[in-house]
C-alpha cells in the first residue's frame, strides 16, 4: 500500500441523494399533473381510461408502512420504468392530435429518465439488489386509431401521477429509516 | 474528511486464515453500501465483495465464494473481510470502498507465500 | 481477464485531447447500468472520477468528461496535464455477478 490518498472526490451521501430524489419526483408529479390537465382541456376524459400494458398500482398509502427499502426502491424503478417507455410510445405512435403536448412530453420524459438514473444510483450507493434497468420488453402495439392515441395518453399521464403521488410518500417514508 | 482505515493484512501460509478490519470516520457509514476490492502486484483492480448498507445483502466473487466472509457493524463503524482457505493468488493490497464505490481506503497488503 | 475491456496504454502530450475506452456485454453496460471511472495515481489508491457515466464529483476538473452509448463508454480528458499521468479504470454492475466489474485498467502516459 501506497501513502494515504488525498482528500476524496466528494459525491452526494445517499441520504442528500434520497432528498434530491425526492425533489425530482415531486417536480415530476407537478409536470404530470399540468400536463393531464392540459390534455382534459384539449380532449375531455369520458370516463376512467385503462391500458392493459400499464403497471398496477403499487401500493396503497395506507400499507406503505410496511415496506422495506429494497423492495420499494425495485418496485418504483420498475414501474417509472414502463412509464417512461409508454411516454416514448406516445410521442412516437400518438399521432398528430397529441403533438399539440409537445414540448411538455419530451420534458416529462427527459425528467423520468433522470429520475430513474437517480435511483438507480441511490441503489448502487446502498448495495441493495439491482435488477437490469433496461429489461427487454415486447413492443406496444400502435393505438387502432387517433382516438385510441388519446384515450391511452389519458391512462398514462394518470396512472404516472398516481405512481409519483405513491414514490414521493414512500420515498420521504424510507429517508426516517435511512 | 471521509476517512476509511484497512488494518489486517500480513504474511500468512496458504491454507491460513485472516481477518480485515476497515474502520470509517466522517461519512455516514450506516447509509453506504461496503465493498472490498483487491489488486494484486502489478495486475488491475478486482472486485472481491459487497454488503448492504444495513447488512442485509452480501454477494461474493466467484474466485472468493465460500472462503470468504464480508460483515458489518454499524454502531462501530466497522466493515469485516473474513479469509479462510487463503491460496498464493489472493496475495493483493485490499481496499475497503463505501458507496458505488466512492471512497477508497489506502489498503492493506495480504502475502500468502509458504 | 477482466469482464470490461479497456486498451492498456494510451498517451498524449500536453494540452492535448485523449479518450479511453471501456467495452462491456449485455450483462453488464448494454443491460443499462451506469459506468464509473477511477483515477489511481502511483502508489495511490484509486479514486472516483465520473460516476453515472457523466457526472462529476465535486473537486473534479471539467476537463473530465464520461459518455456512454450501448455496451460501451468513454472517457475524455482534454487539456492534457502531466499531472494527469496515471490509471484509469471503468466500472459497472454486472447482473450475473450481482457486484461490480472492473475493466483491465488503461496506463496513461503524458509525452
Known amino acids: 500500500p501506497g501513502p494515504p490518498p488525498g482528500p476524496p472526490r466528494v459525491s452526494p451521501d445517499p441520504r442528500a441523494e434520497l432528498d434530491s430524489t425526492v425533489l425530482l419526483t415531486r417536480s415530476l408529479l407537478a409536470d404530470t399533473r399540468q400536463l393531464a390537465a392540459q390534455l382534459r382541456d384539449k380532449f375531455p376524459a369520458d370516463g376512467d381510461h385503462n391500458l392493459d400494458s400499464l403497471p398496477t398500482l403499487a401500493m396503497s398509502a395506507g400499507a406503505l408502512g410496511a415496506l422495506q427499502l429494497p423492495g420499494v426502491l425495485t418496485r418504483l424503478r420498475a414501474d417509472l420504468l414502463s412509464y417512461l417507455r409508454h411516454v416514448q410510445w406516445l410521442r412516437r405512435a400518438g399521432g398528430s392530435s397529441l403533438k399539440t403536448l409537445e414540448p411538455e412530453l419530451g420534458t416529462l420524459q427527459a425528467r423520468l429518465d433522470r429520475l430513474l438514473r437517480r435511483l438507480q444510483l441511490l441503489m448502487s450507493r446502498l448495495a441493495l439488489p439491482q435488477p437490469p434497468p433496461d429489461p427487454p420488453a415486447p413492443p406496444l402495439a400502435p393505438p387502432s386509431s387517433a382516438w385510441g392515441g388519446i384515450r391511452a395518453a389519458h391512462a398514462i399521464l394518470g396512472g404516472l401521477h398516481l405512481t409519483l403521488d405513491w414514490a414521493v410518500r414512500g420515498l420521504l417514508l424510507l429517508k426516517t429509516r435511512l | 474528511e471521509v476517512q476509511l482505515l484497512e488494518s489486517g493484512g500480513g504474511l500468512v501460509q496458504p491454507g491460513g486464515s485472516l481477518r480485515l478490519s476497515c474502520a470509517a470516520s466522517g461519512f455516514t457509514f450506516s447509509s453506504y453500501g461496503m465493498h472490498w476490492v483487491r489488486q494484486a502486484p502489478g495486475k488491475g483492480l478486482e472486485w472481491v465483495s459487497v454488503i448492504s448498507y444495513d447488512g442485509s445483502y452480501k454477494y461474493y466473487a466467484d474466485s472468493v465464494k465460500g472462503r470468504f466472509t464480508i460483515s458489518r457493524d454499524n454502531s462501530k463503524n466497522t466493515l469485516y473481510l473474513q479469509m479462510n482457505s487463503l491460496r498464493a493468488e489472493d496475495t493483493a493490497v485490499y481496499y475497503c470502498?463505501?458507496?458505488?464505490?466512492?471512497?477508497w481506503g489506502q489498503g492493506t497488503l495480504v502475502t500468502v507465500s509458504s | 481477464q477482466s469482464v470490461l475491456t479497456q486498451p492498456p496504454s494510451a498517451s498524449g502530450t500536453p494540452g492535448q485531447r485523449v479518450t479511453i475506452s471501456c467495452t462491456g456485454s449485455?450483462?453488464?453496460?448494454?443491460?443499462?447500468?451506469?459506468v464509473h471511472w477511477y483515477q489511481q495515481l502511483p502508489g495511490t489508491a484509486p479514486k472516483l472520477l465520473i460516476y453515472s457515466n457523466n457526472e462529476r464529483p465535486s473537486g473534479v476538473p471539467d476537463r473530465f468528461s464520461g459518455s456512454k452509448s450501448g455496451t460501451s463508454a468513454s472517457l475524455a480528458i482534454s487539456g492534457l496535464r502531466s499531472e494527469d499521468e496515471a490509471d484509469y479504470y471503468c466500472?459497472?454492475?454486472?447482473?450475473?455477478?450481482?457486484?461490480?466489474?472492473f475493466g483491465g485498467g488503461t496506463k496513461l502516459t503524458v509525452l
Open positions: 466500472a459497472a454492475w454486472d447482473q450475473s455477478l450481482n457486484g461490480p466489474v
Open positions: 449485455s450483462s453488464n453496460i448494454g443491460a443499462g447500468y451506469d
Open positions: 470502498a463505501a458507496g458505488v464505490p466512492d471512497y
